[in-house]
């Protein structure tokens, strides 16, 4: 039975050429995180966190992204381009896999609020 | 041409120290795990340790067996991975070779690790 | 720590022949984080198998791996006189660990 809960930085905003933490966080479960996976919207993996290697960032990332904080990814050098959804992917033993989502708005004005706040989707 | 090269190996006495040097050349090295893999005479493969890329902040792990008196340590803007061997035993003899790790996922997110590219290996004899 | 066996520890074949190579882990180990290398005398091991199945670069398609699990298997389906040596399982751990070896000798 899966107890746990995925909580996300859920909505936020960011400046264009700036950068911008997503972080999802895992509780009220008692299983094991051995992989977390963070995907864009259109599917195409980011990078993933294992628990027994650490993490591999996919080459057509690897600039722009940085690892954490935490199990959280740092995204940098933002283009409009990176405005819509970010999945992070939670597989644990025994309870399976867990599910968050982020919606990233890259904005181009200099005065984009970066808003951060924690929520259960 | 991908190619690591291992250095610095000798006669130590029990107790002693060395310092062992990998230099890789012909691929991206701040990009890739390093593994230290020894083999003591007529014997089997024996992992020691590695360090992880710049990604995962150059992190360690070691072998219990060398566990508080081995250092790995890298210096990539000279592609170098190095081995400090401390208080060494006679049961420390060996041909030491540097490995690069190949860490990766394909599309799927099904991990792979295998060690693709050796070094020719440098010989550590431990005795008095 | 995981351990893996290999065996047997000796198999004395004839070229053309068919070597069939064992490694068993004492626990579950995934698939994709398990490979075979090949050493002969005086020389640096050499990546066969990653994944449990593919074939490293430039490795002939005589050699082939299989299984899942705690066990898994290394084929030569021809023996060549070149590949008489010593084969290692290894798996990711941690700690990463080899198998004791399994040495394929002319007959």
């Known amino acids: 039975m899966m107890t746990g809960t995925i909580e996300t930085t859920g909505n936020i905003s960011a400046k264009k050429g700036g950068s911008v933490i997503l972080q999802c966080h895992l509780s009220s479960t008692m299983a094991q995180v051995t992989q977390v996976n963070w995907e864009q919207h259109d599917h195409s993996l980011l990078a993933i966190r294992n628990a027994e290697l650490g993490w591999h960032i996919y080459p057509a990332f690897k600039d722009r992204v940085a690892p954490g904080p935490g199990l959280g990814l740092t995204l940098q050098s933002l283009t409009m381009n990176d405005t819509g959804e970010y999945f992070c992917t939670y597989h644990t033993y025994p309870d399976g896999t867990y599910r968050g989502r982020i919606f990233l708005e890259v904005l181009e004005s200099s005065v984009a609020e970066h808003s951060a706040r924690f929520q259960i989707p | 041409e991908v190619q690591l090269v291992e250095s610095g190996g000798g006669l130590v006495q029990p107790g002693g120290s060395l310092r062992l040097s990998c230099a890789a050349s012909?691929?991206?090295?701040?990009?890739?795990?390093m593994d230290w893999v020894r083999q003591a005479p007529g014997k089997g493969l024996e992992w020691v340790g590695r360090?992880?890329?710049?990604?995962?902040?150059?992190?360690?792990e070691y072998a219990a067996s060398v566990k508080g008196r081995f250092t790995i340590s890298r210096d990539d803007s000279k592609n170098s991975l190095y081995l400090q061997m401390n208080s060494l035993k006679t049961e420390d003899t060996a041909v030491y070779y540097c490995?690069?790790?190949?860490?990766?996922?394909?599309?799927?997110?099904?991990?792979?690790?295998?060690?693709?590219?050796w070094g020719q290996g440098t010989t550590v004899t431990v005795s008095s | 720590e995981i351990v893996l066996t290999q065996s047997p520890g000796t198999l004395s074949l004839s070229p053309g022949e068919r070597a069939t190579l064992s490694c068993r882990a004492s626990?579950?180990?995934?698939?994709?984080?398990l490979a075979w290398y090949q050493q002969k005398p005086g020389q640096a091991p050499r990546l066969l198998i990653y994944?449990?199945?593919s074939r490293a670069t430039g490795i002939p398609d005589r050699f082939s791996g299989s299984g899942s699990g705690t066990d898994f298997t290394l084929t030569i389906s021809r023996l060549e006189p070149e590949d008489f040596a010593v084969y290692y399982c290894?798996?990711?751990?941690?700690?990463?660990?080899f198998g004791g070896g399994t040495k394929v000798e002319i007959k």
């Open positions: 490995a690069r790790g190949q860490y990766y996922y394909g599309s799927s997110s099904r991990g792979y690790y295998y060690m693709d590219v």
């Open positions: 012909g691929f991206t090295f701040s990009d890739h795990y």
């Open positions: 360090t992880r890329n710049k990604a995962n902040s150059y992190t360690t």
């Open positions: 626990q579950s180990v995934r698939s994709s984080y």
């Open positions: 994944g449990a199945s």
């Open positions: 290894q798996q990711v751990g941690p700690p990463l660990t």
